[in-house]
Interface confidence: medium
């Protein structure tokens, strides 16, 4: 009985990919649709409401036609057939066009990044050799958290010129290790901007800034907000003097009181002389009492 189904019934051979095919049984699609015809008319598939299982048949036909992986001319027009692809399928592809990448990301728009999409992006970026600005622009537009999903090693391939594509929200989920990699790139990218413009651009990267850069910023009347200050590296904040923090925060310095129990404010307070803290007039407590000698143990260790 199954053998009877292998031949295409008379008059049902598909001459083009069109809406009539949605009424074909799966075995009829298999028998009556030529794979080469399908490949040349892939752009039509997306507009035709094939069922979930009919698409399995179409995918199978493409897999047979291109066992080594689909050419980009087919990939660009996969449309929702892309959702049927496995990461193993995608690893066979060579996607070089940003237009192809955008077309496939559009299919998955509004959903979490699937393993298929992650594999596609990985293939694309590796093919390009680096995460250039246009690619980063595209990826962060579809997935604002994309940048923070990369390892510090992967982030090291981001050229400083690409940093211009990064928006503050793209860094929301980055951890300190990632910001440590991104901050020097941002510093380089924005180095020719003037003080206030520079601060606006660099602000969201400051979780990777070292002490000396924070000291330099404190001399520029930047008025850093508390949310940014709370994301700074604790080890970078600890050496700052009360006067430097006051200059860094400007009118926002009053917010320290509300954060005095949280890092890095808590740890910073413990390192300051209490009478220096008192000059802020905020009632911050926990500093080093007057008359106590402050030993810089890190310096002592370095000398021994």
């Amino acid at each position: 009985r199954e053998v009877e189904k292998t031949a295409c019934p008379s008059g049902k051979k598909a001459r083009e990919i069109d809406e009539s095919l949605i009424f074909y049984k799966k075995w009829e699609l298999e028998a009556c649709v030529d794979a080469a015809l399908l490949a040349t008319q892939m752009d039509r598939v997306n507009a035709i409401p094939f069922t979930y299982e009919q698409l399995d048949v179409l995918k199978h036909k493409l897999d047979e036609l291109y066992p080594q992986g689909y050419p980009e001319s087919v990939i660009q027009h996969l449309g929702y057939l892309f959702l049927k692809m496995s990461p193993e399928d995608i690893r066979k592809w060579n996607v070089t066009s940003l237009e192809t990448l955008k077309a496939l990301l559009e299919v998955n728009k509004g959903h979490e990044m699937s393993p298929q999409v992650a594999t596609l992006i990985d293939r694309f970026v590796k093919g390009r050799g680096q995460l250039d600005k246009d690619t980063l622009d595209t990826l962060t537009a579809f997935y604002p958290g994309y940048l923070c999903s990369l390892s510090p090693e992967e982030l090291s391939s981001v050229p400083p010129s690409s940093i211009w594509a990064v928006r503050p929200q793209d860094l929301d989920t980055c951890d300190p290790r990632q910001l440590d990699v991104l901050y020097p790139k941002a510093r380089l990218a924005f180095q020719n901007m003037n003080g206030s413009e520079y601060f606006v651009k660099i602000q969201s990267f400051l979780g990777g800034a070292p002490t000396e850069d924070l000291k330099a910023l404190s001399q520029q009347n930047v008025s850093m907000d508390l949310a940014t200050f709370m994301k700074l590296r604790t080890d970078a904040v600890l050496p700052l003097t009360v006067a430097e923090v006051q200059k860094l925060l400007g009118p926002h310095v009053e917010g320290l009181k509300a954060e005095e129990r949280h890092r890095p404010v808590r740890d910073w307070i413990l390192r300051q002389r209490q009478d220096d803290l008192d000059t802020l007039g905020l009632g911050l407590q926990g500093g080093i009492p007057n008359g106590y000698l402050v030993l810089d143990l890190s310096m002592q260790e370095a000398l021994s």
Epitope: I22, F23, Y24, K25, K26, N46, A47, I48, P49, F50, T51, Y52, E53, Q54, G79, Y80, L83, V107
Partner: nanobody
């Protein structure tokens, strides 16, 4: 098993509009294509409109193109048929259907809702 329940049918004057809804329940998910069929008295059941499982691809019978719009809300497991510029020949029982396979096999059907276009 998939259960489909249609609503929104009724009596309407020529040129009027109706919006049919079909709520799916049971073993359904967003991988089902959904469709509206209709059957007029003494005629065979015919397909009216289809929407695929992503909501991207659609199909309309020639007789309703430009007048009817099919849409779906996957989180609500509901498919809609917006019918404008209704004509007397649109009078029929409208059935909601769902399949993952094809419209000629493994298709689930609703009970139908009557649409009457008359002055």
């Amino acid at each position: 098993q998939v259960q489909l329940v249609e609503s929104g049918g009724g009596l309407v004057q020529p040129g009027g509009s109706l919006r049919l809804s079909c709520a799916a329940s049971g073993r359904t998910d967003s991988t089902y294509n959904m469709a509206w069929f209709r059957q007029a008295p003494g005629k065979e059941r015919e397909i009216v409109a289809v929407i695929n499982w992503t909501g991207g691809g659609t199909y309309y019978a020639e007789s309703v193109k430009g007048r009817f719009t099919i849409s779906r809300d996957n989180p609500k497991n509901t498919v809609y048929l917006q019918m404008n510029s209704l004509k007397p020949e649109d009078t029929a029982v409208y059935y909601c259907a769902a399949t993952r396979t094809s419209w000629t096999e493994n298709t689930y059907w609703g009970q139908g809702t009557q649409v009457t276009v008359s002055s």
